[in-house]
């Protein structure tokens, strides 16, 4: 019968040829009376057999990631009679893996949005690398993720590639972060290959800033001839938030005379001081009122940032008009 062990050949051998093993008939007494032949896909081009001894050699570099298994057939013939000594037999040559592929991030580019001020541990995104090496061959395709850039704000779970927040971030200080993640095979041991990817993490706004008046004092003038409803000037607050979190409402906090009103221009986020009652220079030639500003939308959990509304003082001078 046929005698052989299982055949393995390492991929990417840089030698000209590589001895894989021996196929022989147990009737072969070593006197060169038998001839061994190799048939099948790869016979003669990838593998050869020493026709006298049955030794099998790989004669070209193999790539397991291209082909991991070769099924060949062997024949042994008695040279004297030309007859088969054994029935033709099928055998397998397995290409064994070496760590010749680095991890690759296939879903690049990565981008994530996370609310500013999110607590530690908040999940941002999961990145995943793949390795073409054999997952069943040692640690060639076992990956570990690490953070090359992004500390102290982010962390990555070593085995899953899940990126989490590790420190609160303020969008008003920095609104986006580039995080660089490395995936290393061989679970980081010597001889490991690595791949990197970049993740753009954008912070979305939360309403953590209250509007604040640009000036602590505004000076306006109004003609005593101005009709009610006249706009006599504008006041403005600024809010470091964006979008609807920066929308604000102006109102009168203090106006003993009840002469003025403030309406909000929601397009420009300005406060427009309106004459509510006609004024008379001879009766009162100046007024002092206090205005306040608040955000339009403040979720309950963010009320702590909005405890005291910003206020400003408005001095209004009445202009005299000659009367008949």
């Amino acid at each position: 019968g046929w005698v052989w062990n299982q055949f393995f050949v390492p991929e990417e051998m840089n030698t000209t040829s590589h001895h894989i093993g021996q196929l022989r008939s147990d009737l072969d007494n070593g006197n060169n009376s038998f001839q061994y032949k190799l048939l099948g896909a790869g016979a003669g081009s990838t593998f050869i057999i020493d026709e006298r001894t049955g030794d099998i050699y790989a004669i070209q570099k193999l790539d397991r990631e291209e082909r991991s298994l070769y099924i060949l057939r062997a024949q042994v013939i008695d040279i004297a009679t030309g007859r088969a000594v054994e029935p033709e037999s099928e055998f397998v040559i397995k290409v064994s893996d070496i760590n010749d592929n680095e991890p690759k991030f296939l879903d690049e580019p990565y981008e994530a949005i996370v609310p500013e001020m999110s607590p530690e541990g908040t999940l941002v995104i999961q990145v995943t690398a793949s390795d073409a090496d054999d997952p069943s061959s040692g640690n060639n395709a076992r990956l570990l993720y690490s953070l090359l850039q992004g500390q102290p704000y982010f962390s990555v779970e070593p085995t899953t590639g899940v990126i989490r927040i590790s420190s609160k971030m303020d969008r008003e200080l920095q609104d986006e972060y580039w995080v660089i993640i490395q995936a290393k095979d061989m679970i980081g041991q010597p001889g490991a290959l690595s791949g990197t990817t970049s993740v753009l993490i954008k912070l979305s706004d939360v309403n953590d800033n209250k509007p604040i008046f640009k000036e602590s004092l505004y000076r306006l003038t109004v003609s005593e001839s101005a009709p009610t409803g006249t706009s006599i000037g504008t006041i403005m607050a600024y809010d470091n938030d964006i979008g609807e979190n920066a929308e604000m409402d102006y109102s009168i906090e203090e106006d003993d005379s009840q002469t003025f009103d403030i309406i909000t221009n929601h397009e420009t986020q300005e406060g427009i001081v309106i004459l509510k009652k006609k004024v008379d220079f001879e009766h009162q030639n100046h007024y002092g009122i206090r205005a306040k500003v608040k955000n339009h939308h403040v979720p309950e959990q963010l009320m702590k940032y909005h405890t005291e509304a910003s206020t400003t003082f408005i001095k209004i001078q009445v202009e005299d008009v000659d009367e008949p």
């Epitope: 840089n14 030698t15 000209t16 040829s17 001895h19 003669g44 081009s45 990838t46 050869i48 057999i49 020493d50 026709e51 006298r52 001894t53 030794d55 050699y57 004669i59 070209q60």
Partner: antibody, heavy 121, light 107 residues
Framework: EVQLLESGGGLVQPGGSLRLSCAAS????????MNWVRQAPGKGLEWVST????????YYADSVKGRFTISSDNSKSTLYLQMNSLRAEDTAVYYC??????????????WGQGTTVTVSS | EIVMTQSPVTLSLSLGERATLSCRAS??????LAWFQQKPGQAPRLLIY???TRATGIPARVSGSGSGTEFTLTISSLQSEDFAVYYC?????????FGGGTKVEIK
């Protein structure tokens, strides 16, 4: 008896082309690797190129890569070396050599008598 | 590329003397080494392959030894037909490379 007979050598100008042939007999041509080796006047041996049996794999010395092409015709049991963009330093005797068996597959067990290539203007 | 270094360049010996030729590889080539003999005006002839296996028709006075990086060709008793140039060659890695040769001449 294994025999190898080279032909096609001659005088050629720099930049010119030449095609060498090696007619083989006495063995199953497609089962063996074949080689070209050259020897410049008064110098040692230099490997040029190898082709595996059946022609699936080819290998070249850096000095000829991109200029020379090795090929074989199993039906004619003939090995070829197409030489383009020839240079003065390609001047040599060119030998074809048959590969061996098993572990000596990419070896050189039988040699032809050689053919002379002279590159000169 | 594997560099093959042969020594000595020339060996002057008398008939019947023992010739010892050395060949060193720049890195290990296992036993994938061949020795060739070349006489003036002739093609090289294979003497030894696999570092120590004699080719067909090579007399027993010619022997090879060594593995890894150090190899030796020994001719136990020089005959007139042994005076020639001898080359070692590695076939373990591409590109295949030859040593520079050792000339064995009559003293």
């Amino acid at each position: 008896e294994v025999q190898l007979l080279e032909s096609g050598g001659g005088l050629v100008q720099p930049g010119g082309s030449l095609r060498l042939s090696c007619a083989a007999s006495g063995f199953t041509f497609s089962s063996y690797a074949m080689n070209w080796v050259r020897q410049a006047p008064g110098k040692g041996l230099e490997w040029v190129s190898t082709i595996s049996g059946g022609g699936a794999n080819t290998y070249y010395a850096d000095s000829v890569k991109g200029r020379f092409t090795i090929s074989s015709d199993n039906s004619k049991s003939t090995l070829y070396l197409q030489m383009n963009s020839l240079r003065a330093e390609d001047t040599a005797v060119y030998y074809c050599a048959k590969g061996g068996m098993g572990g000596y597959y990419y070896g050189m067990d039988v040699w032809g008598q050689g053919t002379t290539v002279t590159v000169s203007s | 590329e594997i560099v093959m270094t042969q020594s000595p360049v020339t060996l002057s010996l008398s008939l019947g003397e023992r010739a010892t030729l050395s060949c060193r590889a720049s890195q290990s080539i296992s036993s994938n080494l061949a020795w060739f003999q070349q006489k003036p005006g002739q093609a090289p002839r294979l003497l030894i392959y696999g570092a120590f296996t004699r080719a067909t028709g090579i007399p027993a006075r010619v022997s090879g030894s060594g593995s890894g990086t150090e190899f030796t060709l020994t001719i136990s008793s020089l005959q007139s037909e042994d005076f020639a140039v001898y080359y070692c060659q590695q076939y373990n890695y591409w590109p295949l490379t030859f040593g520079g040769g050792t000339k064995v001449e009559i003293k």
